[in-house]
Amino acid sequence: VPRWRQQWSGPGTTKRFPETVLARCVKYTEIHPEMRHVDCQSVWDAFKGAFISKHPCNITEEDYQPLMKLGTQTVPCNKILLWSRIKDLAHQFTQVQRDMFTLEDTLLGYLADDLTWCGEFNTSKINYQSCPDWRKDCSNNPVSVFWKTVSRRFAEAACDVVHVMLNGSRSKIFDKNSTFGSVEVHNLQPEKVQTLEAWVIHGGREDSRDLCQDPTIKELESIISKRNIQFSCKNIYRPDKFLQCVKNPEDSSCTSEI
């Protein structure tokens, strides 16, 4: 008799999930000498232990603590780049500006980036058919809780000047419901952080508006100010030129506004 299986609204676990996590871990530890001590099998066991045999709507931050411990890593606290709805450019930037780090430049962020996973209560199976959707099913699902946990820890670690890259092409440049808006903003520590500097990335080539005056940016400024942290904002009018100038800062065209 086929066993009844819960049908969730979201896509199922990414195919070859265990193999992908293990392969990513091995690759990361090879590229980053300071993480060569990490035992990737133990990392996978801890990752698996966070969600296997547990109800996928009843996952807690505590479930991920063994994984967090194994993924302990050094990131200079004054070199943190947060992002919202503009992941690709943020990652292109840190690939060039090697001394700055997004969450996905850390081991745990790298392991889980773009993946989906969930299990089933009381069975050791991974559910490849469907996983809970944050809105339609439940917020305490394995993927959402993972990102909430690592994002909170990343924000809590930040110090001095923290940068955030925001997508100026979206209707809500700052979105309170994004991971940045709902988790990271509220976990920056005023004892550690002096300033949050937003970089608003323009989409259109002829877009010369000051998007730092956008109502959602003003909302972000208000939230940050209420945390007793300074706020500043810069328009990045030409993201292509911005990246080029990060690569070649001595280029004569890089003295003008980008």
């Epitope: 302990t72 890593q73 050094t74 990131v75 200079p76 606290c77 850390t106 820890r153 990343f154 809590e156 670690a157 110090c159 005023p190 004892e191 550690k192 952080v193 002096q194 100010s225 209420k226 945390r227 007793n228 942290i229 300074q230």
Partner: antibody, heavy 114, light 111 residues
């Protein structure tokens, strides 16, 4: 340059109230929270809590809930510490210290004696 | 609450010698490998003065005779060589989480 200037020494009787001020200059007052720290005579430093200078919301350490109150006059860039119903064990030097950056006031000595 | 245990409580050092002060935390004060421990110097009748921030960074204007090291739970302040002006009490402070806490202090004297 950044300065935190506190009010002068206080001599009070048990049961009375004292209000200590801390005037900030050299930076935007509402950009940084203000910590309060107690140092009893010959003793170490103890964090009392802090006040958010933008929202005026205070946070008190467990040992300083009840008789202690942090407040602000933001327009004057000044933070206040008020202690009600003074007790002998309140006799100490009280420091204000800006959050982020290691800036401290010179301290205000409170003597409680009948 | 994170408890910071300083040792020794007092220390007598000859001029020109090295002084080493230890600070041990009851739990890690690291976040992503950044140690949120500061070191302060306090002279009688004065407010504390920041010497070292985040375990090993020398505050502007502080002589290079002062250095800090350590991670997670074990931290050290070193003064080498000790000068007469260094006679004071030294405190470690953790700012990784509320409540902020201080060590009990180490009193440095001259031999």
């Amino acid at each position: 340059q950044i300065q935190l200037v506190q009010s002068g020494p206080e001599l009070k009787k048990p049961g009375e109230t004292v209000k200590i001020s801390c005037k900030a200059s050299g930076y935007t007052f509402t950009n940084y929270g203000m910590n309060w720290v107690k140092q009893a005579p010959g003793k170490g430093l103890k964090w009392m809590g802090w006040i958010n200078t933008y929202t005026a919301e205070p946070t008190y350490a467990d040992d300083f809930k009840g008789r202690f109150a942090f407040s602000l006059e933001a327009s004057a860039s000044t933070a206040y510490l008020q202690i009600n119903n003074l007790k002998n064990e309140d006799m100490a030097t009280y420091f204000c210290a800006r959050k982020y950056g290691g800036y401290w006031g010179q301290g205000t000595t409170l003597t409680v004696s009948s | 609450d994170i408890v910071l245990t300083q040792s020794p409580p007092s220390l007598a050092v000859s001029l020109g010698q090295r002084a080493t002060i230890s600070c041990r935390a009851s739990e890690s004060v690291d976040s992503y490998g950044n140690s949120f421990i500061h070191w302060y110097q306090q002279k009688p009748g004065q407010s504390p003065k920041l010497l070292i921030y985040r375990a090993s960074n020398l505050e502007s204007g502080i002589p290079a005779r002062f250095s800090g090291s350590g991670s997670r739970t074990d931290f050290t302040l070193t003064i080498n060589p000790v000068e007469a002006d260094d006679v004071a009490t030294y405190y470690c402070q953790q700012v990784n989480e509320d409540p902020l806490t201080f060590g009990a202090g180490t009193k440095l004297e001259l031999k």
